[in-house]
């Protein structure tokens, strides 16, 4: 057992048929020694007597909030949450696996630049009863320190007869350098509790890995005198670093017919313009990624080739 | 050239050959062996690898003041990476795949290390450590690992000679 | 299996230019380096360029600098080497093959014929 | 560029018996060379990388040896399938060079 906040306990418990439990002691936070009583959640049955209960843990019935009273005025509570370990495994009940980009994904996290700056996002198909509470630091032997805000209710989507919750949080690093190489990972840990079930997540990466640049800002196309021909241009997104003379960016574009079958001409390049040839109905798109590191594309940037 | 008295060094070519090495770093990673092996073990297996630190003086304010220290700092990098390709972690069993790039990245690395430092001048290298494993998984699982680092040791090499190219050339 | 088949014969006429492909199946296109070599009847094999799917970067032996662009369309695994302002110095067999250290696979070749 | 000078520019031998193909290199190239066979109207095909490295399938009569500059190709025990054209190649820095080839033919 262990204290995950005030007054609040998680038991960790081994999940099986049979299995015999834990033993909990919990003690009446009061100067009083005599006429203490026990009672657990909303019911009035006396569990025991004395400033210290003693009860054994074997499942969800036996978690909730125990209370000591004394002549009818509460003296303390203590919570307690059950940690359901199965076959050696933790349970993973509460949230969703993701699945991308690898099984047993439950959080995801992207950066737009290389500021600190980092948003981490997990779904779960609970829409009550639920809590959240996110740590972060750089490191783990030493960590140095990350300041995330509070988990909130990002999006609600309907998949098939489910409703699907998202929940995200941002993160920013304390001393973020990011000109620098990063040597340890930044660390994520989540506690979710969903009524007296606990659970932990967490998630391990560099911010270079989760960089994904705003796709291109003002795309635009400059039809070329007696040519099929168009200049494109765009700019960068104002979210990324700067100077862009050291965090650049290389651009994908792309011309695309109106059938996903017709060949997608694509042109690579360094620059903020690029000259192709629109097709009728066709459209073109511009997308970013870091210039030296391969982390994630943006998401594409369009306009109509007409 | 970036020469140990302090002139500068070929900020273009330094930036095309590095620009050439993130690429190389890239296209060598998945060709290293025949083992599908992920990230795995602890993080400690390359940490004693040289990583371009917060107070090397490689972010652009840096660069400005003196780019001499970061400099120095790249050049220990390339010849630390180089002389781990060359070493028995890469030559060793299991053999690289054919299609491998490895032999490209080594000859970049040098390449790269002797634009930073022409013969006859000397900066300081850092020790190389003695990472030899014995089994051939651990030198296929070392191999990710150095070349992921590798990768992200280039891409801030790579920004600071495009960052010297634009604002520092004479 | 891994497999390159490259585009038929091509019967051209000087200064002309030609595009020649290389079909890529069996294996993860973007991952690999694609390799292009030029063959004159009864010689030596000669490096013209590579190209890395994933980001388009390419490279050129000085030497065709300007004769051969190297190009992929990663939507259908292809790799493409355009010859430009041909001669009959041109006229030889091509081919790719995949990787940027040993070539392990190959193309059938391609043979370019520059003739009036 | 690397030179790569390949020798004999031409070899004749019966079958069984042992042939050995050497290349040297301009620089040193570490063990950065592939070997390949190529007949008549065909692609080539590789034998050997890495300078050691049997490729998939490749008989084990063949072998390659040598590190730097100086490498060769052993061929024992000689088959009449084992006749054509041998070359090396180097795939140290861009560009890579070839050597210009070894005609081995039957006796």
């Known amino acids: 057992i262990w204290e995950l906040k005030k007054d609040v306990y998680v038991v960790e418990l081994d999940w099986y048929p049979d299995a015999p439990g834990e033993m909990v002691v919990l003690t009446c936070d009061t100067p009083e020694e005599d006429g203490i009583t026990w009672t657990l959640d909303q019911s009035s049955e006396v569990l025991g007597s004395g400033k210290t209960l003693t009860i054994q843990v074997k499942e969800f019935g036996d978690a909730g909030q125990y209370t000591c009273h004394k002549g009818g005025e509460v003296l303390s509570h203590s919570l307690l949450l059950l940690h359901k370990k199965e076959d050696g495994i933790w349970s993973t009940d509460i949230l969703k696996d993701q699945k991308e980009p690898k099984n047993k994904t439950f959080l995801r996290c992207e950066a737009k630049n290389y500021s600190g700056r980092f948003t981490c996002w997990w779904l779960t198909t609970i829409s009550t009863d639920l809590t959240f509470s996110v740590k972060s630091s750089r490191g783990s032997s030493d960590p140095q320190g990350v300041t995330c805000g509070a988990a909130t209710l990002s999006a609600e989507r309907v998949r098939g007869d489910n409703k699907e919750y998202e929940y995200s949080v941002e993160c920013q690093e304390d001393s973020a350098c990011p000109a620098a190489e990063e040597s340890l990972p930044i660390e994520v840990m989540v506690d979710a509790v969903h009524k007296l079930k606990y659970e932990n997540y967490t998630s391990s990466f560099f911010i270079r890995d989760i960089i994904k640049p705003d796709p291109p800002k003002n795309l635009q196309l400059k039809p070329l005198k007696n040519s099929r021909q168009v200049e494109v241009s765009w700019e960068y997104p104002d979210t990324w670093s700067t100077p862009h003379s050291y965090f650049s960016l290389t651009f994908c574009v792309q011309v695309q017919g109106k059938s996903k079958r017709e060949k997608k001409d694509r042109v690579f390049t360094d620059k903020t313009s690029a000259t192709v040839i629109c097709r009728k109905n066709a459209s073109i798109s511009v997308r970013a990624q870091d210039r030296y590191y391969s982390s994630s594309w943006s998401e594409w940037a369009s306009v109509p080739c007409s | 050239r970036a020469v140990p008295g302090g002139s500068s060094p070929a900020w273009t070519q330094c930036q095309q050959l590095s620009q050439k090495l993130c690429t190389l770093a890239w296209s060598a990673h998945p060709l290293v062996g025949h083992m599908d092996l992920r990230e795995e073990g602890d993080e400690e297996t390359t940490n004693d690898v040289p990583h371009i630190q917060c107070g090397d003086g490689c972010d652009p304010q840096g660069l400005r003041d003196n780019s001499q220290f970061c400099l120095q700092r790249i050049h220990q990098g390339l010849i630390f990476y180089e002389k781990l390709l060359g070493s028995d972690i890469f030559t060793g069993e299991p053999s690289l795949l054919p299609d491998s790039p490895v032999g490209q990245l080594h000859a970049s690395l040098l390449g790269l290390s002797q634009l930073l430092q022409p013969e006859g001048h000397h900066w300081e290298t850092q020790q190389i450590p003695s990472l030899s494993p014995s089994q051939p998984w651990q030198r296929l699982l070392l191999r990710f690992k150095i070349l992921r680092s590798l990768q992200a040791f280039v891409a801030v090499a790579a920004r600071v000679f495009a960052h010297g190219a634009a604002t520092l050339s004479p | 299996h891994v497999q390159l088949q490259q585009s038929g014969p091509e019967l051209v006429r000087p200064g002309a230019s030609v595009e020649l492909s290389c079909k890529a199946s069996?294996?993860?296109?973007?991952?690999?380096?694609m390799t292009w070599m030029k063959q004159r009847p009864g010689q030596g094999l000669e490096w013209i360029g590579q190209?890395?799917?994933?980001?388009?970067?390419?490279d050129y032996n000085e030497m065709f600098e300007g004769k051969a662009t190297l190009t992929v369309d990663t939507s259908s695994n292809t790799a493409y080497m355009q010859l430009s302002s041909l001669t009959s110095e041109d006229s030889a067999v091509y081919f790719c093959?995949?990787?940027?250290?040993?070539?392990?696979?190959w193309g059938q070749g391609t043979l370019v014929t520059v003739s009036a | 560029d690397i030179q790569m000078t390949q020798s004999p520019a031409s070899l004749s031998a019966s079958v069984g018996e042992t042939v050995t193909i050497t290349c040297r290199t301009s620089?040193?190239?570490?063990?950065?060379l592939a070997w390949y066979q190529q007949k008549q109207g065909k692609s080539p095909q590789l034998l050997v990388y890495?300078?050691?490295t049997l490729a998939e399938g490749v008989p084990s009569r063949f072998s390659g040896s040598g590190s730097g500059t100086q490498f060769s190709l052993k061929i024992n025990r000689l088959q009449p399938e084992d006749f054509g054209r041998y070359f090396c190649?180097?795939?140290?820095?861009?560009?890579?060079?070839f050597g210009s080839g070894t005609k081995l033919e039957i006796k």
């Open positions: 093959a995949r990787g940027g250290g040993g070539f392990a696979y």
């Open positions: 069996g294996y993860i296109f973007i991952t690999y380096w």
């Open positions: 190209i890395f799917p994933a980001s388009g970067s390419a």
């Open positions: 620089e040193n190239i570490y063990s950065y």
């Open positions: 890495n300078a050691k």
């Open positions: 190649q180097h795939h140290y820095g861009i560009p890579f060079t």
